[in-house]
């Protein structure tokens, strides 16, 4: 039991499998933790081990792969299961060794359960589509390997529980799944199930993904400030306080990192003196355009406050834009009490 | 390197007109940019007279230029500036400049070399 | 529209002096402030924005502030290379009207 390398349980690769269906799971030192991968591990004389841990115990044991029909199965850096039990749930280890190396890394599994209409615990990717784009596709995910490409499978597509059959603008084409024009309507879970023969049994792949449509490229603008604008004047007397919301409209656009920030004579708030604070909201339209309000505050305004410069500034993909507020002093109106008092007094 | 470059420029005879040509190199018109003519007169200040939105193709103009100046954008890299009923007040160095921000502030923070016209008979 | 009056027209002081220019503005501008240097048969250069926001590369010896209608550029620490007239200028981006006011110019001369 010489030193191990051992690079913990990698909960980022949390795998979620449907019960009663083939599951192939690559060993992830290869994909993530070494430099090499199983051909040159292997023509180097390291073994790959597998064994696991139970569900609510802590005891290592190793996988038995003599079950019947070769229920569990390894092949090179693959872990299979044809098919998969509730009860395979659990830590699972593979771990890389000769005589002087060793490297393993553990991984969560978890087989669940689906009802007739493929709800189930398990997460969903997303796939987004953009609305009226023209043709696009989503792929059944994550079915490559599973069985050789003399094998032609059957793809039933499904929308929520009902099968994909004269849809208006959805038109599945094998692996693929057509929508001719995405519609908000288009929005929700869209599941392939891919069902192949092997060695004389019949198996069944079930994958669900969340479609949802989002704004298009095509009617994407840069930042849109809404607030500080030109009508709006911030008249404040000193002592008040003054709200100077920065309201910043942002078109969806891919990967795109929305900013907004606000500048105080040219700076950060965080980098002057006065006390200042800012509080952010967002919101969403369904097609997943973005809504930034920052709200800048300071709680006693003084006359010198009410002569800096405040500029609302935003950016993403589509460029940079800002705005400056409108600030200015309210100036008191005369008070006329005395005088008034005076005129009235008795002769 | 992003640049713009003007050309057009030259002597024109008054009642004539011209167009200016404005290129930009290390960028392109493809994104959200506003890009804008400013002239100076033979020893005088600067002056703004038109721009335009390269996304929106919004076009912006000095309340003077109304009428005998246009703006366009013509390719993916060139805008330009159609001049006509042009007078020897119209004799300067025309600049084009782009904005510092992605739709019009009037912050100009990139500024080609400029082209002179002369309106002269 | 607005008229950007800049004072003086012109300024001369020594290496290492300071310079202040001024502007004043036909009308509450708020921020929309901006300062170029422009030299002798060259390209304008924005230097500030927004009153006092500085355009990255431009030193700190440049700096802007005012607000409302009267606005000053200072040139500290006067280097013969800032030699060159300053315009101030009035950037405003109103959708109903758009009108970019510059001053009138003010020359550095430095001894």
């Known amino acids: 039991s010489e030193r191990c390398d051992d690079w913990g349980l990698d909960t980022m690769r949390q795998i979620q499998v449907f019960e009663d269906e083939p599951a192939r799971i690559k060993c992830p030192l290869f994909e993530h933790f070494l430099k090499f991968n199983y051909s040159t591990a292997h023509s180097a004389g390291l073994t790959l081990i597998w064994y696991w841990t139970r569900q609510d115990r802590d005891l290592e044991e190793p996988i038995n792969f003599r079950l019947p029909e070769n229920r569990i199965s390894k092949e090179k850096d693959v872990l299979w299961f044809r098919p998969t039990l509730l009860n395979d749930t659990g830590n699972y280890t593979c771990m890389l060794r000769n005589t002087t190396y060793c490297s393993k890394v553990a991984f969560p599994l978890e087989v669940v359960q689906k009802d007739s209409c493929f709800n189930s615990p398990m997460k969903l990717p997303v796939h987004k589509l953009y609305i009226e784009y023209g043709i696009q596709r989503i792929t059944c995910p994550n079915v490559d390997g599973y069985f050789p490409s003399s094998v032609k499978p059957t793809i039933t597509w499904y929308m929520g529980c009902y099968k994909i059959q004269n849809f208006n603008n959805v038109i599945p084409e094998g692996m693929n799944l057509s929508f001719l024009i995405a519609l908000i309507s288009n929005n929700g879970n869209y599941t392939c199930v891919v069902t192949y023969p092997e060695n004389g049994r019949t198996f069944h792949l079930t994958r669900t993904l969340t479609v949802k449509v989002v704004g298009s490229p095509k009617n994407a603008v840069p930042p849109v400030i809404h607030s500080p604008n030109d009508h709006v004047v911030y008249e404040k007397e000193p002592g008040e306080e003054l709200l100077i919301p920065c309201t910043v409209y942002f078109s969806f656009l891919m990967d795109s990192r929305n900013e907004v920030w606000w500048t105080i004579d040219g700076k950060k708030p965080d980098d002057i003196t006065i006390d200042v604070t800012i509080n952010e909201s967002i919101s969403h339209s369904r097609t997943e355009d973005e809504t930034r309000t920052q709200i800048l505050s300071i709680k006693k305004v003084t006359s010198e406050d009410l002569k800096r410069s405040y500029v609302c500034h935003a950016r993403s993909a589509k460029g940079e834009v800002a705005k400056a507020a409108k600030v200015k002093q309210k100036v008191p109106a005369p008070r006329y009490t005395v005088e008034l008092a005076c005129g009235f007094g008795a002769t | 390197q992003e640049q713009l470059v003007e050309s057009g420029g030259g002597l024109v005879q008054p009642e004539g007109s011209l167009t200016l040509t404005c290129q930009a190199s290390g960028f392109t018109f493809s994104s959200y940019y506003v890009i804008c003519w400013v002239r100076q007169a033979p020893g005088k200040g600067l002056e703004w007279i038109a721009c335009i939105g390269t996304g929106d193709g919004l076009t912006y103009y000095a309340s003077w230029a109304k009428g005998r100046f246009t703006i366009s954008k013509t390719s993916s890299t060139t805008v330009t500036l159609q001049m006509t009923s042009l007078t020897a007040a119209d004799t300067a160095t025309y600049f084009c400049?782009?904005?510092?921000?992605?739709?019009?502030?009037?912050?100009?923070?990139?500024w080609g070399p400029g082209t002179l016209v002369t309106v002269s008979s | 529209d607005v008229v950007m009056t800049q004072t003086p027209a012109s300024v001369e002081a020594a290496v290492g002096g300071t310079v202040t220019i001024k502007c004043q503005a036909s009308?509450?501008?708020?921020?929309?402030c901006a300062w170029y240097q422009q030299k002798l048969g060259q390209r304008p250069k924005l230097l500030i924005y927004y009153v006092s926001t500085l355009e990255s590369g431009v030193p700190s010896r440049f700096e802007g502030s005012g607000y409302g209608t009267e606005f000053t550029l200072t040139i500290s620490d006067l280097q013969s290379a800032d030699a060159a007239t300053y315009y101030c200028?009035?950037?405003?981006?109103?959708?109903?009207?758009?009108?970019?006011?510059f001053g009138g110019g003010t020359e550095v001369v430095v001894k």
């Open positions: 400049a782009r904005d510092r921000y992605a739709t019009v502030s009037g912050i100009l923070n990139l």
């Open positions: 009308q509450n501008i708020y921020s929309n």
């Open positions: 200028q009035y950037t405003y981006d109103s959708s109903s009207s758009t009108s970019w006011a």
